[in-house]
C-alpha cells in the first residue's frame, strides 16, 4: 500500500484517502456515490483485452 503523494495508483484505480489505499475503480461502477470512489470519477477505465481479434 502506498502513501499519497508517491507513485500514482495503477491504471484503473485511484487513491482513496478514506481507505488509505488504492481503490479499484471497477468496484466503483456499482457504487458511484461512495466517498471512497471520488477519485475514480476522473480515473481512466481499467484496460481490458478483447476476447476476439
Amino acid at each position: 500500500e502506498q502513501a499519497p503523494g508517491t507513485a500514482p495508483c495503477s491504471r484503473g484505480s485511484s487513491w482513496s484517502a478514506d481507505l488509505d489505499k488504492c481503490m479499484d475503480c471497477a468496484s466503483c461502477r456499482a457504487r458511484p456515490k461512495s466517498d471512497f470512489c471520488l477519485g475514480c470519477a476522473a480515473a481512466p477505465p481499467a484496460p481490458f483485452r478483447l476476447l476476439w481479434p
Epitope: 478514506d18 481507505l19 481503490m23 468496484s27 456499482a30 457504487r31 456515490k33 466517498d35
Partner: antibody, heavy 120, light 108 residues
Framework: EVQLLESGGGLVQPGGSLRLSCAAS????????MIWVRQAPGKGLEWVSY????????HYADSVKGRFTISRDNSKNTLYLQMNSLRAEDTAVYYC?????????????WGQGTLVTVSS | DIQMTQSPSSLSASVGDRVTITCRAS??????LNWYQQKPGKAPKLLIY???SLQSGVPSRFSGSGSGTDFTLTISSLQPEDFATYYC??????????FGQGTKVEIK
C-alpha cells in the same frame, strides 16, 4: 480472538464533555477503518463517525458534526470519540466497530458498548 | 440520504417457523446491504454481508437475497436463540452508512 472494549461512558450534564475509548486486541489494528455507532434507549442503530486506517480522514453524522471528534492511536491500538457540548439526545449506548472487507462494506466485530447518559 | 425501511417492525413466530424480513432502500443500493442480529443488552452481530454472503460462523439457516432496492433476510427454521432484533444496513454511500429501524422477532 478479536476484541473491542469500550470505556469512558457515564453520566454527564448537558453541555458537558466525555471521551470514549475503544481498545482493540487480537488483530492488527492499523489497517482497519473504524466507526462509532450509537443506540438510544429502546431505539435503533445510528452511525456516528468514521475514521480511516491512518486517522487522516474522518466523517461525521450531521447530528454530531462540530461537537464530536473521532481519532485513533495506532501505536496503542485504541480508537477515541471526544464528545463536547453534549445534549440529552446524545444519551445512548456507544459501540465501536471494525470495518471489514477490502472496501469497508460491513462491520464484522463490535465492542460491547458503553452507556452515555446526558442529564441534569 | 438513503433511507432504509424494514418490515414488519415486529413479528411473532414459533420455533421451526420460516421467517422472512424485508428491507427496502429509498433508492438503488446495488448489492451493498448487510444484516445484523442484536440481542437485548448485546452488541450487533454480522449475519449476512453484500446482500447474500453468509458471515463465517453463522448458521446456514440464515440467508439473504435481493438487489437494487428490495432485500430479504430469511430464517429457514427458527431456533430459540434466533429471537432477537434484526437490522439491515446499507454501505452503498460508505462511509456514510444507514441502518433500518429494526425488526423484532418474538416468541408466539
Amino acid at each position: 480472538e478479536v476484541q473491542l472494549l469500550e470505556s469512558g461512558g457515564g453520566l454527564v450534564q448537558p453541555g458537558g464533555s466525555l471521551r470514549l475509548s475503544c481498545a482493540a486486541s487480537g488483530f492488527t489494528f492499523s489497517p482497519y477503518p473504524m466507526i462509532w455507532v450509537r443506540q438510544a434507549p429502546g431505539k435503533g442503530l445510528e452511525w456516528v463517525s468514521y475514521i480511516s486506517p491512518s486517522g487522516g480522514s474522518t466523517h461525521y453524522a450531521d447530528s454530531v458534526k462540530g461537537r464530536f471528534t473521532i481519532s485513533r492511536d495506532n501505536s496503542k491500538n485504541t480508537l477515541y470519540l471526544q464528545m463536547n457540548s453534549l445534549r440529552a439526545e446524545d444519551t445512548a449506548v456507544y459501540y465501536c466497530a471494525r470495518g471489514g472487507d477490502t472496501y469497508f462494506d460491513y462491520f464484522d466485530y463490535w465492542g460491547q458498548g458503553t452507556l452515555v447518559t446526558v442529564s441534569s | 440520504d438513503i433511507q432504509m425501511t424494514q418490515s414488519p417492525s415486529s413479528l411473532s413466530a414459533s420455533v421451526g417457523d420460516r421467517v422472512t424480513i424485508t428491507c427496502r432502500a429509498s433508492q438503488s443500493i446495488s448489492g451493498y446491504l448487510n444484516w445484523y442480529q442484536q440481542k437485548p443488552g448485546k452488541a450487533p452481530k454480522l449475519l449476512i454481508y453484500q446482500a447474500s454472503s453468509l458471515q463465517s460462523g453463522v448458521p446456514s439457516r440464515f440467508s439473504g437475497s435481493g438487489s437494487g432496492t428490495d432485500f430479504t433476510l430469511t430464517i429457514s427454521s427458527l431456533q430459540p436463540e434466533d429471537f432477537a432484533t434484526y437490522y439491515c444496513q446499507q454501505s452503498y454511500t460508505s462511509p456514510f452508512i444507514t441502518f433500518g429501524q429494526g425488526t423484532k422477532v418474538e416468541i408466539k
